[in-house]
Interface confidence: low
């Protein structure tokens, strides 16, 4: 019979190749059947008999058409910082991915080998680049006129509220505190409304901690990163 309608096993034409889902057995020198996903070759073919396939045992798999003598072992159970997004079946390996709040620090062909907790940006710092499945959060100091008062892997720096009358000027880790009603939120990050009176130094200055500031006391323009004041809260 011509090769294209032959039943396995068969000898390929000189210079020819075996068909899809077949392989060339060097020992038998014949084109033989591959085993489907979820099975493996229990008995290899001969000149007169085709491959004998058998189902994979528990906790083993084959994902592709194959002629392997044994199925592949599924990976170990997912660790506590991972979730199983694909169970181990006869046709597919277990896939472990990092749980929310974590990212894959060391990946493997499928899933993740090592998860790491996403960096938290501390007060005075906001997320400059969010974490992804395979990359960590990048934090950046809050720019002038913005703040973050949280320890978070997701919060960005937010604009200070604009006050009619400023009780305490905001800094990188604390919102401005207003004495008047109806404060407005700055639309443009970096917009800084100065309290009066104000003492301005160089462009990079820090707010001086002043827990009990008397009326008329000069404030420093709050600019640049600043770690948190103990017990401080936004307005």
């Amino acid at each position: 019979l011509p090769a294209q309608v032959a039943f396995t096993p068969y000898a390929p034409e000189p210079g020819g190749t075996c068909r899809l889902r077949e392989y060339y057995d060097q020992t038998a020198q014949m084109c033989c059947s591959k085993c489907p996903p979820g099975q493996h070759a229990k008995v290899f073919c001969t000149k007169t008999s085709d491959t004998v396939c058998d189902s994979c045992e528990d906790s083993t798999y084959t994902q592709l058409w194959n002629w392997v003598p044994e199925c592949l072992s599924c990976g170990s159970r997912c660790s506590s910082d991972q979730v199983e997004t694909q169970a181990c079946t006869r046709e597919q390996n277990r896939i472990c991915t990092c749980r929310p709040g974590w990212y894959c620090a060391l990946s493997k062909q499928e899933g993740c080998r090592l998860c790491a907790q996403l960096r938290k940006c501390r007060p005075g710092f906001g997320v400059a680049r969010p974490g992804t499945e395979t990359s960590d959060v990048v934090c950046k100091p809050c720019a002038p006129g913005t703040f973050s008062n949280t320890t978070s892997s997701t919060d960005i720096c937010r604009p200070h509220q604009i006050c009619h009358v400023v009780a305490i000027p905001g800094n990188a880790s604390m919102d401005a505190v207003c004495t008047s009603t109806s404060p407005t939120r700055s639309m443009a990050p970096g917009a800084v409304h100065l309290p009066q009176p104000v003492s301005t130094r160089s462009q990079h200055t820090q707010p001086t901690p002043a827990p009990s500031t008397a009326p008329g006391t000069s404030f420093l323009l709050p600019v640049g990163p600043s770690p948190p004041a103990e017990g401080s809260t936004g307005d």
Epitope: C121, V138, C139, P141, Q206, P225, P227
Partner: antibody
Framework: EVQLVESGGGLVQPGGSLRLSCAAS????????MTWVRQAPGKGLEWVGI???????YYATWAKGRFTISRDNSKNTLYLQMNSLRAEDTAVYYC?????????????????WGQGTLVTVSS | DIQMTQSPSSVSASVGDRVTITCQAS??????LAWYQQKPGKAPKLLIY???KLASGVPSRFSGSGSGTDFTLTISSLQPEDFATYYC????????????FGGGTKVEIK
């Protein structure tokens, strides 16, 4: 093993320039705040400046304008460019990494430190 | 400009003594203070961070306390290897700052 190794120190004339390098191994430089600290012979520690994870640099008031901190993430190396050097800049220069304790981006304490490199400014 | 003032500048003590070094910040720095030990010809070594937390591998005879502006490093029972210079360092602000380190305290053998 986490390690920092400084290089580039040596003798330079007043008014000259020098670039110090700090090669990091065992961690990614871009994931931490990095600082430069110097120590004049027989004197205490003096902070030079710091570079954050976003690549922004901050300097001691006396270092602004003359000193520049930068880094090359591909080489995992930190740099200190020093210009208009004076005799009083003679010191051992150390690079150090922010500890990052608590998973914070910046913990405000430094460990490990490099072994230091000596810069001598003299005619 | 936050100033860090350490005292005393030097102290003579014997093995087994309790040694206390103080560090004062000119402004409130909350708990953002670290202590370092430095021996001649060597790089500084972190002892304490966030005012009272012991760094990895540091013996428990070292302890730190304080918050706000006043801080203390205590060596409960001085050992021969503890003779060195100790520095405090504020980690609160690094903008518009002259130096984040204190002047140092040399612990010498009596």
């Amino acid at each position: 093993e986490v390690q920092l190794v400084e290089s580039g120190g040596g003798l330079v004339q007043p008014g000259g320039s020098l670039r110090l390098s700090c090669a990091a191994s065992g961690f990614s430089l871009s994931d931490y705040f990095m600082t430069w600290v110097r120590q004049a012979p027989g004197k205490g520690l003096e902070w030079v400046g710091i570079i954050n994870t976003g690549g922004d640099s901050y300097y001691a008031t006396w270092a602004k304008g003359r000193f520049t901190i930068s880094r090359d993430n591909s080489k995992n190396t930190l740099y200190l460019q020093m210009n208009s050097l004076r005799a009083e800049d003679t010191a051992v220069y150390y690079c150090a990494r922010d500890t990052g304790y608590g998973g914070y981006d910046y913990a405000g304490s430094f460990d490990p430190w490099g072994q230091g490199t000596l810069v001598t400014v003299s005619s | 400009d936050i100033q860090m003032t350490q005292s005393p500048s030097s102290v003579s003590a014997s093995v087994g003594d309790r040694v206390t070094i103080t560090c004062q910040a000119s402004e409130n720095i909350n708990s953002w203070l670290a202590w370092y030990q430095q021996k001649p010809g060597k790089a500084p070594k972190l002892l304490i961070y966030e005012a009272s937390k012991l760094a990895s591998g540091v013996p428990s005879r070292f302890s730190g306390s304080g918050s706000g502006t006043d801080f203390t490093l205590t060596i409960s029972s001085l050992q021969p290897e503890d003779f060195a210079t100790y520095y405090c360092q504020q980690g609160y602000i690094y903008i518009d700052v002259g130096n984040i380190f204190g002047g140092g305290t040399k612990v010498e053998i009596k």
